[in-house]
């Protein structure tokens, strides 16, 4: 999906009002310096591309974050403010339904969410290019 035509300001507002708080809640009890950020993003479409991939793609040691509250709100924000996004996400929805069965917070998942926080912070930088 090409995130170039998203309403970035609306997504930013959604992040600031709820998604950021859900990420903090998920990370509660973890020191902010515990994990090194190894990925970043260049402009807003790039940030959303990486946020989407990191949130919804299973990785080694963290089978799924898709069932978490921040993930569901991220999906909703992208569906509302990125034209045509929902149509591209049928497979991701199936993955979310499967993932809802088990909810385990591993250290690898904490590390992944720490990376997500960094990507979202970069997305919100005032000087970051729209595209």
């Amino acid at each position: 999906y090409d995130f170039t035509n998203c309403d970035f300001e609306k997504i930013k507002a959604a992040y600031l009002s709820t998604i950021s708080k859900d990420l903090i809640t998920y990370m509660s009890g973890t020191k902010s310096t515990e994990f090194n950020n190894t990925v970043s993003c260049s402009n807003r479409p790039h940030c959303l591309t990486e946020i989407q991939s990191l949130t919804f793609n299973p990785t080694a040691g963290c089978a799924s974050l898709a069932k978490e509250m921040f993930a569901m709100k991220t999906k909703a924000a992208l569906a509302i403010w990125c034209p045509g996004y929902s149509e591209t996400q049928i497979n991701a929805t199936q993955a979310m339904k499967k993932a809802r069965k088990s909810k385990v917070t591993t250290n690898k998942c904490l590390e992944q969410v720490s990376q997500l926080q960094g990507l979202w912070r970069r997305f919100n930088r005032p000087l970051l290019k729209q595209q």
């Epitope: 990925v39 790039h46 991939s53 000087l127």
Partner: antibody, heavy 117, light 108 residues
Framework: QVQLQESGPGLVKPSETLSLTCTVS?????????WSWIRQPPGKGLEWIGY???????SYNPSLKSRVTISRDTSKNQFSLKLSSVTAADTAVYYC??????????WGQGTLVTVSS | EIVMTQSPATLSLSPGERATLSCRAS??????LAWYQQKPGQAPRLLIY???SRATGIPARFSGSGSGTDFTLTISSLEPEDFAVYYC??????????FGQGTKVEIK
């Protein structure tokens, strides 16, 4: 300390597919960072080809996108480049590198690929 | 595509002298700029990122400055091992990261 090593044929015929592999030691490619390919034609500057991130997202240089495929094999801690329909203009030293998806902090030593019949 | 232009193409200096290398972007890249050093037959090495932050293990004689479209890499006092080609790279314009054509710093 992370080390990267490119391998693959040094000679490819025009119109065929160039295939290279980068073997990474000292760091798991599924643990963090992105894993990138960059090339440098003889005596010229650098050109970014694309990357695959540790969580599987892939990004390509638009000028090469139609011909490029980057993939990975986490069991071997390797990632690969395929460039189809090559011409003499694709003759270059090809580097693999570790990236934070912005810049490149560790590089392989490079491998020269010549496109010639 | 953002075009990165480096000047001069070649800089002839003696060890101990100060080197000032320029990199100009065709449009603003904020501080999304890196500098690399490449010696003959070797891979590039990251020197500077975010326009002014030194990469791990890079000596303090290397410094970067600038923002927007104009950037400078300064080597305060050239050591024999600093004679090489230097490239700038912008990473503001995903998915079209571009490099400058390089500046060669040679021994006078």
């Amino acid at each position: 300390q992370v080390q990267l090593q490119e391998s693959g044929p040094g000679l490819v015929k025009p119109s065929e597919t160039l295939s290279l592999t980068c073997t990474v030691s000292g760091y798991s490619i599924s643990s963090g960072y992105g894993w990138s390919w960059i090339r440098q034609p003889p005596g010229k500057g650098l050109e970014w080809i694309g990357y695959i991130s540790y969580y599987g997202s892939i990004s390509y240089n638009p000028s090469l996108k139609s011909r490029v495929t980057i993939s990975r094999d986490t069991s071997k801690n390797q990632f690969s480049l395929k460039l189809s329909s090559v011409t003499a203009a694709d003759t270059a030293v090809y580097y693999c590198a570790r990236t934070n998806l912005l810049y490149f902090d560790s590089w392989g030593q490079g491998t020269l690929v010549t496109v010639s019949s | 595509e953002i075009v990165m232009t480096q000047s001069p193409a070649t800089l002839s200096l003696s060890p101990g002298e100060r080197a000032t290398l320029s990199c100009r972007a065709s449009q603003s890249v904020s501080n999304n700029l890196a500098w690399y050093q490449q010696k003959p037959g070797q891979a590039p090495r990251l020197l500077i990122y975010d326009a002014s932050s030194r990469a791990t293990g890079i000596p303090a004689r290397f410094s970067g400055s600038g923002s927007g479209t104009d950037f400078t890499l300064t080597i305060s006092s050239l050591e024999p091992e600093d004679f090489a080609v230097y490239y700038c790279q912008q990473y503001s314009d995903w998915p079209q990261y571009t490099f400058g054509q390089g500046t060669k710093v040679e021994i006078k």
